[in-house]
Interface confidence: medium
């Protein structure tokens, strides 16, 4: 499998403490929208799922930073294509999910890797920890 760490800003959403509580409406609905969005973006067979969605405050707390890990079958996609396909979807994300996306950053994730190799992110990602958000677990609500 190939893993990619992806980070982006949602500039039209306000960060608040509900995004630090995974049992709230705000957290669950945003996670659902993002999961569905990625299933739309990477429809090709190589996409396996995403995990470790994390929400953080953007600059000044006026936006939401989303961080997550994407998994693909080995050799089906590279960093450049992951970023390109995501950037190409930004307009549709705005109209379909009302998410204004900016500051996209994608990087390779060596797998497995230790906490030290992620430079303080503390998001240790291991095979047995993957919590897939797959298509059949989500019902479109738009």
């Amino acid at each position: 499998m190939s893993f990619f760490f992806l980070s982006f800003h949602i500039s039209n959403l306000q960060f608040n403490s509900s995004l630090e509580d995974p049992s709230t409406d705000y957290y669950q609905e945003l996670q659902r929208d993002i999961s569905e969005m990625f299933l739309q973006i990477y429809k090709q067979g190589g996409f396996l799922g995403l995990s470790n969605i994390k929400f953080r405050p953007g600059g000044g707390g006026g936006s939401v930073v989303v961080q997550l890990t994407l998994a693909f079958r080995e050799g089906t996609i590279n960093v450049h294509d992951v970023e390109t396909q995501f950037n190409q979807y930004k307009t549709e994300a705005a109209s379909r999910y009302n998410l204004t996306i900016s500051d996209v950053s994608v990087s390779d994730v060596p797998f497995p890797f230790s906490a030290q190799s992620v430079d303080g992110l503390n998001d240790i990602f291991e095979a047995q920890k993957i919590e897939w958000h797959e298509l059949e677990h989500h019902h479109h609500h738009h």
């Epitope: 630090e20 709230t24 990602f125 920890k129 919590e131």
Partner: antibody
Framework: EVQLLESGGGLVQPGGSLRLSCAAS????????MSWVRQAPGKGLEWVSG????????YYADSVKGRFTISRDNSKNTLYLQMNSLRAEDTAVYYC?????????WGQGTLVTVSS | QAVVTQEPSLTVSPGGTVTLTCGSS?????????ANWVQEKPGQAFRGLIG???KRAPGTPARFSGSLLGGKAALTLSGAQPEDEAEYYC?????????FGGGTKLTVL
């Protein structure tokens, strides 16, 4: 002052039902997710169920799924736990807890005893 | 359902430092597990100390801090006080449920 007051516990036979209530005061109840947590006699804590601030999302431990139902009435500042098909292993003190940064405030608990 | 493990008991000297840990049967604990730490003292209501891995609940003394350490969640108590003698429980979030650990009995001696 934040206060959570549980009620509705008691002695019930196996297979019976109980409805627990948790009356909240001292904070804006409708903006907080809430949970029920229990502690069996001489044991540690076990999370039972949780609910999002509007009640749109509910969560259950595997041990109670299909038997317990969590709900809330934000107009009454009250959290509920409907417990059906009770078993001896459900015997415990049941606590309601608020969740913003950790389970920060807890009630004093209500004792549920399931015995014939 | 995942199993969350804690040290059954630990002892610290007054003024000393101690670290309680919280491990997961599914692998390394991450920030996505939103580790929580709860304190239980006899005759008192439970009290949340730390949520979201490292955020202190209102009223939590600064001597308590939360972090991730070696693939586990950790609660560090720096400058232990006699009143810190208690049972400490951690809880981890797994997608749609919380799981508590068995608790650590901390003795200040």
């Amino acid at each position: 002052e934040v206060q959570l007051l549980e009620s509705g516990g008691g002695l019930v036979q196996p297979g019976g039902s109980l409805r627990l209530s948790c009356a909240a005061s001292g904070f804006t109840f409708r903006v907080y997710a809430m949970s029920w947590v229990r502690q069996a006699p001489g044991k540690g804590l076990e999370w039972v169920s949780g609910i999002s601030e509007t009640g749109s999302y509910t969560y259950y431990a595997d041990s109670v799924k299909g038997r317990f139902t969590i709900s809330r009435d934000n107009s009454k500042n009250t959290l509920y736990l409907q417990m059906n098909s009770l078993r001896a292993e459900d015997t415990a003190v049941y606590y309601c807890a608020r969740y913003p940064y950790g389970f920060d405030y807890w009630g004093q608990g209500t004792l549920v005893t399931v015995s014939s | 359902q995942a199993v969350v493990t804690q040290e059954p008991s630990l002892t610290v000297s007054p003024g000393g430092t101690v670290t309680l840990t919280c491990g997961s049967s599914t692998g390394a604990v991450t920030t996505s597990n939103y580790a929580n730490w709860v304190q239980e003292k006899p005759g008192q209501a439970f009290r949340g100390l730390i949520g979201g891995t490292n955020k202190r609940a209102p009223g939590t003394p600064a001597r308590f801090s939360g972090s991730l350490l070696g693939g586990k969640a950790a609660l560090t108590l720096s400058g232990a006080q006699p009143e810190d003698e208690a049972e400490y429980y951690c809880a981890l979030w797994y997608s749609n449920l919380w799981v508590f650990g068995g608790g650590t009995k901390l003795t200040v001696l």
